[in-house]
């Protein structure tokens, strides 16, 4: 019972997480005027990812889209970068995630299987909350360097006789979603994880014993022994034509990925 | 057609007070900032107060700041300027403006004339 | 707060020749965010509120003869008229709408000779 509702949980956790770093993504306050200490101005810059926007006390918003690929910053790009695998990432581990349910029965999926994918999934998450926690830092890292550079020289000109105030850029809405969405995707992750480790049955305290027919050797399993093998490994019961006598331990071969947890 | 018509104008003595009402039709009256401009007799234009769309922002020049208000009332499609401590300084025409592209003011009052004087 | 110069403060001009006001912003008007200057151009007739003609410095507005030209960038603004015609009489003015607090020009007083 545990198990299956820290596995609903870091599934609902993960799916909020991701639907955050979607937003964050799509999202054009990245980047906000810095109204601090600033002239008032009767416009409001902001930018995202994808697009910069300029909202006038008048009311009208104008966006215009980063058309360029190649102008952009090399770190936009890999912000960009960032966040679009983290969104692949968290999309696959949802769709993983579902099938990997304990609530949900699937045919005749074994646990060893869910086991298999819950840990699939939970890297994922992981990996995809990661990512977008990096790509969030690199930008606000960004942002403090450009910000810090813009205000050493604020007013630029000539001769001090007009002026040209820079514009000065701080932390957007975008980056703590992302940063919050990063780290529920991450949470997530890390509770599928844990999850997997309930989802996988316990290795049994018996050997499998080795009965010796008359033709050949025929080794059997216990009836009713599910082990969880991973993927290509035997399961069901099934018959292991061998010489000699051995145990269920040795004839396990391929370790399934949740013995390494 | 855009539409704006004023109130509440006319003869104060100095320390008084009056508030100006500025009803609005032919548009989304929510949805544009707002301003009031004035000019004093024979003076180059003045602004006064501009109340911005979308997030209930309000300025004001110096001259006017914490005496002036400007208020507006989506539901009525009516803009207010009221005025407090008025000084002799303060006669002129009043118009309101709706602010549109660039901050641009493209549609104006005809203008009330408010008159300071003891 | 920004100061407007505008010049000249009268301009007589004979119908049909052109006629160039110029303005001048102590501070850029130019918003880095959109390359937008925050410069705009009315005409106010005797007796009549004033009348939007530019925008953004250089975007006419509705209804404003093609005769009349906005240029300008950053605090070197100019209005121009190819061909004066007796209808284009009254006063001038370019405003910042830029920043806070918006601040007009003197005003160029146009008229016929």
């Known amino acids: 019972m545990a198990v299956t509702a820290c596995q609903g949980l870091g599934f609902v956790v993960s799916l909020i997480g991701i639907a955050g770093i979607i937003a964050a993504t799509c999202m054009d306050q990245w980047s906000t005027q810095d109204l601090y200490n600033n002239p008032v101005t009767a416009v409001f810059n902001y930018q995202g990812l994808w697009r910069s926007c300029v909202r006038e006390s008048s009311g009208f918003t104008e966006c215009r889209g980063y058309f360029t690929l190649l102008g952009l910053p090399a770190m936009l790009q890999a912000v960009r970068a960032l966040m679009i695998v983290g969104i692949v990432l968290g999309a696959i581990g949802l769709l993983v995630s579902i099938f990997a349910l304990k609530c949900i029965r699937i045919g005749s999926m074994e646990d060893s299987a869910k086991a298999n994918m819950t840990l699939t999934s939970g890297i994922m998450f992981i990996v995809s909350g990661l990512c977008a926690i990096a790509g969030v830092s690199v930008f606000a890292n960004m942002l403090v360097t450009n910000f810090w550079m813009s205000t050493a020289n604020m007013y630029t000109g000539m001769g001090g006789m007009v002026q040209t105030v820079q514009t000065r850029y701080t932390f957007g809405a975008a980056l703590f979603v992302g940063w919050v969405a990063g780290g529920l995707t991450l949470i997530g992750g890390v509770m599928m994880c844990i999850a997997c480790r309930g989802l996988a049955p316990e290795e049994t305290n018996y050997k499998a014993v080795s009965y010796h027919a008359s033709g050949h050797s025929v080794a059997y399993k216990p009836g009713g022994f599910k082990a969880s093998t991973g993927f290509g490994s035997n399961t069901k019961n099934k018959k292991i034509y061998d010489g000699g006598a051995r145990t269920e331990d040795e004839v396990q071969s391929y370790p399934s990925k949740h013995d390494y947890v | 057609e855009v539409q704006l018509l004023e109130s509440g104008g006319g003869l104060v003595q100095p320390g008084g007070s009056l508030r100006l009402s500025c009803a609005a039709s032919?548009?989304?009256?929510?949805?544009?900032?707002m301003s009031w401009v004035r000019q004093a007799p024979d003076k180059r234009l003045e602004w006064v107060a501009t109340f911005s769309s979308g997030g209930d922002y309000t300025f004001y020049p110096d001259s006017v700041k914490g005496r002036f208000t400007i208020s507006r009332d989506n539901s009525k499609n009516t803009l207010y300027l009221q005025m407090n401590s008025l000084r002799a300084e303060d006669t002129a025409i009043y118009y309101c403006?709706?602010?549109?592209?660039?901050?641009?003011?493209?549609?104006w009052s005809q203008g009330l004339s408010v008159t300071v004087s003891s | 707060d920004i100061v407007i110069t505008q010049s000249p403060l009268s301009l007589p001009v004979t119908p049909g020749e052109p006629a160039s006001i110029s303005c001048k912003s102590s501070?850029?008007?130019?918003?880095?965010?959109?390359?937008?200057?925050?410069l705009t151009w009315y005409l106010q007739k005797p007796g009549q509120p004033p009348k939007l003609l530019f925008y953004?410095?250089?975007t006419r507005e509705s209804g404003v003869p093609d005769r009349f030209t906005g240029s300008g960038s950053g605090t070197d603004f100019t209005l121009k008229i190819s061909r004066v015609e007796a209808e284009d009489v009254g006063v001038y003015y370019c405003?910042?709408?830029?920043?806070?607090?918006?601040?007009f020009g003197g005003g160029t007083k146009l008229e016929i000779k």
């Open positions: 953004w410095a250089s």
């Open positions: 403006a709706k602010l549109y592209y660039g901050n641009s003011m493209d549609s």
């Open positions: 405003q910042n709408a830029y920043y806070y607090p918006f601040t």
């Open positions: 032919g548009f989304t009256f929510s949805k544009f900032g």
């Open positions: 501070q850029s008007l130019l918003n880095s965010g959109n390359q937008r200057n925050y």
